[in-house]
């Protein structure tokens, strides 16, 4: 053996070095990689170095047993069965309330025969649900509406307005509440007329006297 | 009838560990999460987190994580909570209880609850 | 997570009047639950997903709200509806409750 080099190094199973004839001179750098399936334990980079001892042990390769963390989901909660995810595992998602799962909600960690463990799908996605709308309310008679539309988007609000010469009578505004099924937060409003409002309300009848009969009204009626 | 039974009370030392139980009946107990929730003596109220019988999965309110561990006996129906590294803190009333489906978000039954003492 | 604010912390009323109490979001809630809670003993589901009575509910009582604000109502007050009421919601994990309002019979 020459005594002007590191020791030769040698093929670790499940696995290959780079390069495969490394020069074994002072400085030379040797990457050791694992195949599909395996991974890499102890220091994957070895360094010949001025001593002409390597500058770490020889790695090896284990074979991998579990799924990589397939990570959270926005407006979810998940429930993991092992924390390390090895195959076998599961996690499942659940959106929150007003969210929609689009995907997957459990995944299950698969071994390969090639390869690393996979899990069964991607992760899902929850989405926004999309509410119902409302659907128009007519306008009071004597009175307006705006916007005038037949669906109002959930959350939206209308309001309502009477023709001159009428009060309204209920809320001048009303709201689409979200929900399943959106609704109205009020009954629609009515319009009234000023004046029988006022009559009702604070009059009282007068009867003024007759004058006195002639025939000449008498011919009028 | 559905019905969430819990195990009695305890008294506990500083630093312990406490398992509890609660024992479904009623309906299919793999048919549903169960949930564990506390409510300390300011009669607040948190969810600890929660465990689906059939796969054994859990997910823990972030503030429980290192507190509690929650798993099940699916041959007797029977969800448990172990809380480790008492304090005095962890004194409450802990409650099992159940959602209606998974497209629920509200606790439709709930254990009579498990007082639970810390103290030297 | 959403924190849950509810007033007030405690309020009493006589029989037959009408009660409010409200429940304020950190952040805004698609829905909000409500659970009675006496005193010895478990919460029960009291209205859920905002305005649905639970079986059992007198008609009494009415939810109502959206976005950050919510509210439950008694019409009118009975005897029997002296306790404390909690709100909740999950439209963000980890749920989270309010603090309650405990209801006292003048």
């Known amino acids: 053996p020459r005594n002007d080099t590191c020791p030769e190094l040698p093929e670790i199973p499940n696995g290959w070095k780079s390069p495969s004839q490394p020069e074994l001179v002072h400085g030379t750098v040797v990457t050791y990689q694992c195949y599909p399936g395996y991974q890499v334990v102890g220091s994957s980079v070895l360094m010949c170095q001025w001593d002409l001892t390597w500058s770490e042990d020889l790695p090896s390769c284990q074979r991998v047993t579990s799924c990589h963390d397939p990570g959270d989901v926005e407006h979810s909660r998940r429930l993991i069965s092992s924390p390390k995810f090895p195959v076998g595992a599961t996690v499942q998602y659940i959106c929150d309330q007003g969210f929609v799962l689009m995907g997957s909600s459990i995944l299950t960690c698969h071994d390969r025969q090639a390869g690393s463990p996979k899990w069964s799908d991607r992760a899902p996605k929850c989405l926004l649900e999309q509410l119902k709308p409302c659907h128009g309310l007519s306008a009071p008679e004597n009175g307006a509406r705006s916007p005038e539309k037949q669906l109002h988007p959930a959350g939206a609000t209308i309001h309502f307005s009477c023709a001159p010469g009428y009060v309204l009578k209920g809320q001048a505004s009303i709201k689409c509440v979200p929900g399943h099924p959106s609704h109205w937060s009020d009954p629609p409003p009515i319009c009234r007329a000023a004046s029988l409002d006022g009559f009702y309300n604070s009059r009282s009848l007068d009867v003024a006297k007759a004058p006195a009969a002639s025939s000449t009204l008498d011919a009028a009626h | 009838e559905v019905q969430l039974q819990q195990s009695g009370p305890e008294l506990m030392k500083p630093g312990a560990s406490v398992k509890m139980s609660c024992k479904a009946s009623g309906y299919t107990f793999t048919d549903y999460n169960m949930h564990w929730v506390k409510q300390n003596q300011g009669k607040s109220l948190e969810w600890i987190g929660e465990?689906?019988?059939?796969?054994?999965?859990?997910g823990y309110n972030q503030k429980f994580k290192d507190k509690a561990t929650l798993t099940v006996d699916k041959s007797s129906s029977t969800a448990y909570m172990e809380l480790r590294s008492l304090t005095s803190e962890d004194s409450a009333v802990y409650y099992c209880?159940?959602?209606?489906?998974?497209?629920?978000?509200?606790?439709?039954?709930w254990g009579q609850g498990t007082t639970l003492t810390v103290s030297s | 997570q959403i924190v849950l604010t509810q007033s007030p912390a405690i309020m009493s009323a006589s029989p037959g009047e009408k009660v409010t109490m409200t429940c304020s979001a950190s952040s805004s809630v698609s829905y909000m639950h409500w659970y009675q809670q006496k005193s010895g003993t478990s919460p029960k589901r009291w209205i859920y997903?905002?305005?649905k009575l639970a079986s059992g509910v007198p008609a009494r009582f009415t939810g109502s709200g959206s976005g950050t604000s919510y509210s439950l109502t008694i019409s009118s007050m009975e005897a029997e509806d002296a306790a404390t009421y909690y709100c909740q919601q999950w439209s963000s994990s980890p749920p989270t409750f309010g603090a309650g309002t405990k209801l006292e019979l003048k």
């Open positions: 997903d905002t305005s």
């Open positions: 465990i689906n019988p059939n796969t054994g999965g859990t």
């Open positions: 209880a159940r959602i209606p489906s998974l497209r629920r978000y509200y606790f439709d039954y």
